[in-house]
Interface confidence: medium
C-alpha cells in the first residue's frame, strides 16, 4: 500500500519521495530493500538521502530495485517503499509507454500542461517544452512557471508533452526530463465565459468636441450555436433605447462571425456630434450568454489638440 | 423585497393561446435572467425556457419550439410567456423564475445559477 | 438533453433522523475551467412553487437551515436532511444548469415515519 513508482532516465537526475509523510522534524531513514544497507546522507555520494528525499545524482540503469524508508517520530516508525526503474536514453524519438506519466487533458479554456514530478527539484526558469521530440515554437505556446499554455488549443495540439530542466545541487547541474501525453476534449461546443476583445476593461477613449465617435464591443462566447448569447452597450447603467439620447445609437456590427471556430458579437456604439456632457456618462460594453455576463467599461476623454497635432 | 407576481388563472379552448404575465419588483430587472418552468397536476417541473431582459435574447425546450414566445418589457419589469396552439396536456401551473446571479472577483463575471425567486404561478387550464 | 434520475421516488423518515436523496446526472455537470457543478437542489411544498435550497452543488442559499447541505461532482449527487423536521415534508427536486434544455429530476417525495 505504501509502495511508489518512480522512474527515470540514465545519466539524469531523479529524485523520489518517501511514500510514507511525516513532519519536517521527523528523520528519516533510506535502506537498500534487498540488502538492508543504510543509504548515506553525504552529498558527496552519487546516491544520498536528505531526510524524505532519496537522490540520484545522476542516476544509473543499475540504481534499479526496492528501497525502503523509515520514517521515525518518538512515538511511531513507519515504513514505506520506493519501487526505483532507472532506464537507457531511447536513441530514437519515441517516448515508450512506462516512461510516460499520467495523461492530462484540455480544452480551448483551460489548456495547461503541467510539468510532472518538478516540485521535487531544485531548478529554475525557464523550462524547455518538445511535443513529439520537437521543440515549440510560436506565441501559441507559453512556458509559465511550472506548466505550459496552450492559446487557442485545438485537436491537434494532441500529443506527447516533454518538459526539460536543470536541477541544481550544490553547484553541480543536472538535467531532468519528463514526458505526459495531453489530450484535447470539446467542451460541448460553448464557452461558458463571455470573452470581452473589445473595449479592455476601464479603457479611456479619446473624442473630439463636435466630432462623430464609434465604440465597438466584441465578445467571443465559444464554439457552436450560442444559446442567450448578447452583446450590448448601456449608459450610466441604463440601456440605449431607454437613455433617451437620440445623437447616441447602437447598431449591430457581424453577427455570430466564426473566425477560428469561436462564435463572435460586435455592437457598435455611434455617438453623432461629440458633446461635453458624453464625457461625464460612463459607457459599459456587456456580453452575456447563458451562463452569465461580462461588464468592461469606458469614459471618453477630449482629445487634446496638441496631442492631435504632433 | 424581491417578488414576482404572476397573472390570474386562465381556462382556454384547445387550439387558442394564453399569454401569462410575470410582473418583477425590488431589483434591476435587466441585470437577471427570466426562466419559465410549468408543473402538470400532479407531475415534475419542466423547463419552458428563458429570456435575458438585458439582452432581449431567449432559448425554448425543443418541445415548445414554435409554440411558446416569451417576452419582456423593460419600461415596466414585466416577463411574458406566450404558448399558442394549446392542447389538453399543456394544463399546468405556469411559473416564472427569476435566474440567481453570483459575482465572481476572480473573473471578473456575473455567474447565473440556478432559479433563486419564482412566482406564485398561473393555473392554466385547457378544456373544451 | 441531460437526463436527471433521482432516488428514491419517496421516503419516510423519522423526526430527527437523517434523509438522504441521490441525483444522478447522464452527463457530467461539472464545468472544468472553473471546478463547479451546475446543479441546483428545490424544495415544493404542496400548492407552493418550488424554493432554492442548494446551488453549485453544495452552496447553501441564504435564508435555508444548515441542516440541509448537498454534496457530490460530476454525475452524482446527494442532497442530506441531517435531522428531519416536520417542515421538511415536500417534494425534492435537483436541476442541472450545465446546458440548454434546463432539466430537472423526476422528483422524491419526504414524509415522517
Known amino acids: 500500500k505504501f509502495s511508489k513508482q518512480s522512474w527515470g532516465l540514465e545519466n539524469e537526475a531523479l529524485i523520489v519521495r518517501c511514500p510514507r509523510q511525516g513532519k519536517p522534524s521527523y528523520t528519516v531513514d533510506w535502506y537498500y530493500s534487498q540488502t538492508n544497507k543504510s543509504i548515506p546522507t553525504q552529498e558527496r555520494n552519487r546516491v544520498f538521502a536528505s531526510g524524505q528525499l532519496l537522490k540520484f545524482l545522476p542516476a544509473a540503469v543499475a540504481d534499479s530495485g526496492i528501497y525502503t524508508c523509515i520514517v521515525r517520530s518518538p512515538t511511531f516508525n513507519r515504513t514505506g517503499y520506493a519501487n526505483v526503474t532507472i532506464y537507457k536514453k531511447q536513441s530514437d524519438c519515441n517516448v515508450p509507454d512506462y516512461l510516460m506519466y499520467s495523461t492530462v487533458s484540455g480544452s480551448e479554456k483551460n489548456s495547461k500542461i503541467y510539468c510532472p514530478t518538478i516540485d521535487l527539484y531544485n531548478w529554475t526558469a525557464p523550462l524547455e517544452w518538445f511535443k513529439n521530440c520537437q521543440a515549440l515554437q510560436g506565441s501559441r505556446y507559453r512556458a509559465h512557471k511550472s506548466f505550459l499554455v496552450i492559446d487557442n488549443v485545438m485537436t491537434e495540439d494532441a500529443g506527447d508533452y516533454t518538459c526539460k530542466f536543470i536541477h541544481n545541487e550544490n553547484g553541480a547541474n543536472y538535467s531532468v526530463t519528463a514526458t505526459r501525453s495531453f489530450t484535447v476534449k470539446d467542451e460541448q461546443g460553448f464557452s461558458l465565459f463571455p470573452v470581452i476583445g473589445a473595449p479592455a476593461q476601464n479603457e479611456i477613449k479619446e473624442v473630439e468636441i463636435g466630432k462623430n465617435a464609434n465604440l465597438t464591443c466584441s465578445a467571443c462566447f465559444g464554439k457552436g450555436t450560442q444559446f442567450l448569447a448578447a452583446v450590448l452597450w448601456q449608459l450610466n447603467g441604463t440601456k440605449i433605447t431607454d437613455f433617451g439620447e437620440p445623437r447616441i445609437q447602437q447598431e449591430e456590427g457581424q453577427n455570430q462571425s466564426f473566425s477560428n471556430g469561436l462564435a463572435c458579437l460586435d455592437m457598435v456604439l455611434r455617438i453623432a456630434d461629440v458633446k461635453e456632457e458624453d464625457l461625464l456618462l460612463q459607457y459599459d460594453c456587456l456580453a452575456l450568454n447563458l451562463h452569465g455576463l461580462r461588464r468592461h467599461t469606458v469614459r471618453l476623454s477630449r482629445k487634446n489638440p496638441i496631442d492631435h497635432h504632433s | 423585497q424581491v417578488q414576482l407576481v404572476q397573472s390570474g388563472a386562465e381556462v382556454k379552448k384547445p387550439g387558442s393561446s394564453v399569454k401569462v404575465s410575470c410582473k418583477a419588483s425590488g431589483y434591476t430587472f435587466t441585470d437577471y435572467q427570466m426562466h419559465w418552468v410549468r408543473q402538470a397536476p400532479g407531475q415534475g417541473l419542466e423547463w419552458v425556457g428563458v429570456i435575458n431582459p438585458g439582452g432581449g435574447s431567449t432559448t425554448y425546450a425543443q418541445t415548445f419550439q414554435g409554440r411558446v414566445t416569451i417576452t419582456a418589457d423593460e419600461s415596466t419589469s414585466t416577463a411574458y410567456m406566450e404558448l399558442s396552439s394549446l392542447r389538453s396536456e399543456d394544463t399546468a401551473v405556469y411559473y416564472c423564475a427569476r435566474g440567481g446571479v453570483e459575482y465572481s472577483s476572480s473573473w471578473d463575471y456575473y455567474y447565473y445559477y440556478g432559479m433563486d425567486v419564482w412566482g406564485q404561478g398561473t393555473t392554466v387550464t385547457v378544456s373544451s | 438533453d441531460i437526463v436527471m434520475t433521482q432516488s428514491p421516488d419517496s421516503l419516510a423518515v423519522s423526526l430527527g433522523e437523517r434523509a438522504t436523496i441521490n441525483c444522478k446526472s447522464s452527463?457530467?455537470?461539472?464545468?472544468?475551467?472553473?471546478?463547479?457543478?451546475?446543479l441546483a437542489w428545490y424544495q415544493q411544498k404542496p400548492g407552493q412553487p418550488p424554493k432554492l435550497l442548494i446551488y453549485?452543488?453544495?452552496t447553501r442559499e441564504s435564508g435555508v437551515p444548515d441542516r440541509f447541505s448537498g454534496s457530490g461532482s460530476g454525475t452524482d449527487f446527494t442532497l442530506t436532511i441531517s435531522s428531519l423536521q416536520a417542515e421538511d415534508v415536500a417534494v425534492y427536486y435537483c436541476?442541472?444548469?450545465?446546458?440548454?434544455?434546463?432539466?430537472f429530476g423526476q422528483g422524491t417525495k419526504v414524509e415522517i415515519k
Open positions: 452527463q457530467s455537470v461539472l464545468y472544468r475551467s472553473n471546478n463547479k457543478n451546475y
Open positions: 453549485w452543488a453544495s
Open positions: 436541476q442541472q444548469y450545465y446546458s440548454i434544455p434546463v432539466t
